[in-house]
């Protein structure tokens, strides 16, 4: 025969059980709270640090690009692609038509101080986009040159020069002393490339990668 | 980890916690119900009151449960 | 609403659901234990225990309520 428990012992046992259960409850709720806090605070900190990063990134561009035009990339709220405000965007790049007349070297320098290069044209689609913003009676430097005058054309960003993706006017390039490329309009064949002397001032087209913030 | 990814992971943790606890709660509830029926048969319905009250609690929980 | 916002709302719902269910589960667990202890007592004292237990449960719940 099992000895009957005293009511006092039973109360004490119940009290311990209650303590254990409620301790478990508190621990569980604390864990839940931690989870929830992490869920709320970490993204906030993440957003904060991301904002700080964004601001420092923007500060880099501030000197030459006081204002940016940004669009949301995809569905993710945190991915924005930006171009400096007067620039136009196409695919993953920004373009700027410089109407100032400068030699090829200075045009490239002018682009580089804005964090860009003279334009490198990789596709027909890209050229078709660019020419929409050009004036027919002007010529514009491209980021294409032949420094040695040996017909070894090279792009400023070291993109390999591909003969199959070039848009020279017929009969061009035609002069070993003309070591820089321009894009211009000829009534007979629309827009195309021509080689000219690098020191002759022309307008130019700058291209830079979109700024992702 | 990115912001949304972290949120989805925590969602999953909370969701699993909710499921596990719901199952445990229901299991305990069923045990209580069974114990109540058994003890009613043995002790002239002593636990009927307890059983009924628990049922009320369960019903309230059902109403108040947020839609998933 | 954007995807991440929706995720945070879901987080909040699951969090509250988890807390409510944790409290209910613990309350039920204690009720079961008390009921088990009470069943050892004499039949005439059965409802006294039950009544007391409800009061205790209510008080405990008040103490343990998490700060909002």
């Amino acid at each position: 025969m099992v000895p009957e428990e005293e009511p006092q012992d039973r109360e004490k046992g119940l009290w311990w059980f209650q303590l254990k259960v409620w301790s478990m409850a508190v621990v569980s709720i604390l864990l839940l709270s931690v989870c929830f806090t992490v869920s709320s605070v970490v993204p906030h900190n993440f957003m904060y640090s991301k904002t700080v990063k964004r601001l420092s990134k923007l500060r880099e561009y501030q000197q030459y690009h006081p204002s940016l035009t940004c669009v949301m990339e995809g569905k993710d709220i945190e991915d924005w692609s930006c171009c400096p405000t007067p620039w136009t965007s196409f695919q993953s790049s920004c373009y700027f038509i410089s109407t100032g007349m400068q030699s090829w070297t200075k045009s490239q320098k002018n682009c580089s101080v804005m964090g860009a290069d003279l334009v490198v044209i990789n596709t027909r689609e890209e050229q078709d986009f660019i020419i929409q913003n050009l004036k027919r009676n002007s010529s514009y430097f491209l980021g294409l040159s032949d420094p040695g005058g040996r017909r070894h054309w090279q792009w400023v960003d070291q993109t390999p020069y591909n003969e199959n993706v070039t848009f020279w006017h017929s009969g061009e390039p035609n002069n070993l002393d003309e070591r820089c490329a321009i894009i211009n309009f000829r009534s007979s064949e629309e827009w195309g490339w021509n080689d000219i002397h690098c020191h002759v001032p022309q307008k130019s087209i700058c291209k830079m990668k979109k700024i992702y913030i | 980890l990115g912001e949304p990814q972290l949120c989805y992971i925590l969602d999953a943790i909370l969701f699993l916690y909710g499921i596990v606890l719901t199952l445990l709660y229901c299991r305990l509830k069923i045990q209580v119900r069974k114990a109540a029926i058994t003890s009613y048969e043995k002790s002239d319905g002593v636990y009927t009151g307890l059983s009924t009250r628990n049922q009320e609690t369960y019903e309230t929980l059902k109403h108040e449960k947020p839609p998933q | 609403l954007g995807e991440p916002q929706l995720c945070y709302i879901l987080d909040a719902i699951l969090f509250l659901y988890g807390i409510v269910l944790t409290l209910l589960y613990c309350r039920l667990k204690i009720q079961v234990r008390k009921a088990a202890i009470t069943s050892y007592e004499k039949s005439d004292g059965v409802y006294t225990g039950l009544s007391t237990r409800n009061q205790e449960t209510y008080e405990t719940l008040k103490h343990e309520k998490p700060p909002q």
Epitope: H197, H199, V200 | - | -
Partner: antibody, heavy 120, light 107 residues
Framework: DVQLQESGPGLVKPSQSLSLTCSVT?????????WNWIRQFPGNKLECMGY???????NYNPSLKDRISITRDTSKNQFFLKLNSVTTEDTATYYC?????????????WGHGTLVTVSA | DIQMTQSPVSLSASVGETVTITCRAS??????LAWYQQKQGKSPQLLVY???SLVDGVPSRFSGSGSGTQYSLKINSLQPEDFGSYYC?????????FGGGTKLEIK
């Protein structure tokens, strides 16, 4: 050696056109560079007026755009300046010069200059 | 247009002295600056290009310096043939503008 020489009338009446010629020897104007007209006012202020490039395209100083024209005669290796509707303000010494020397960093070759007086 | 401000407008110095002429651009001209010397009744002669490069045949007592918007021409140990007018001209972007000139006279 490259040499440039300006020529033209030294006196022009107000509202008439000023026409000057720059004759180049020692280098073909179609081979390269850009060929400038520069003037120096009586107070010694210098002003770039515009140029014609080796391939025949032009660029003019915006302050003169609607009055100026620069052309060339490749067979004679000459380029020309025409300034319409002149006033006494256009009295200056007119120089022709070759641009694009030293990576476009200075005009190394100048003509001797010709003084043009605008007076009734 | 980029404006060029030259100073001083005139300067008196003795043979053997060192003088400095300064030129300020209204914008960054990235060292694309030329200095000319002009003697009475003659055309300007290029002395310095790209801010600090001396043209062949120009004496080494002439030196150019500066960057951004501030540039200067220094003439060490002045010689009698150095007297005349000096002009700066930027070559950054068309139109290329000249400074107002500095007249260097014998004291």
């Amino acid at each position: 050696d490259v040499q440039l020489q300006e020529s033209g009338p030294g006196l022009v009446k107000p509202s008439q056109s000023l026409s000057l010629t720059c004759s180049v020897t020692g280098y073909s104007i179609t081979s390269g560079y850009y060929w400038n007209w520069i003037r120096q006012f009586p107070g010694n202020k210098l002003e770039c007026m515009g140029y014609i490039t080796y391939d025949g395209s032009n660029n003019y100083n915006p302050s003169l755009k609607d009055r100026i024209s620069i052309t060339r005669d490749t067979s004679k290796n000459q380029f020309f300046l025409k300034l319409n509707s002149v006033t006494t303000e256009d009295t200056a010494t007119y120089y022709c010069a070759r641009g694009g020397d030293y990576d476009d960093g200075g005009f190394a070759y100048w003509g001797h200059g010709t003084l043009v007086t605008v007076s009734a | 247009d980029i404006q060029m401000t030259q100073s001083p407008v005139s300067l008196s110095a003795s043979v053997g002295e060192t003088v400095t002429i300064t030129c300020r651009a209204s914008g960054n001209i990235h060292n694309y600056l030329a200095w000319y010397q002009q003697k009475q009744g003659k055309s300007p002669q290029l002395l310095v290009y790209n801010a600090k490069s001396l043209v062949d045949g120009v004496p080494s007592r002439f030196s150019g310096s500066g960057s951004g918007t501030q540039y200067s021409l220094k003439i060490n140990s002045l010689q009698p043939e150095d007297f005349g007018s000096y002009y700066c001209q930027h070559f950054w972007i068309i139109p290329y503008t000249f400074g107002g000139g500095t007249k260097l006279e014998i004291k």
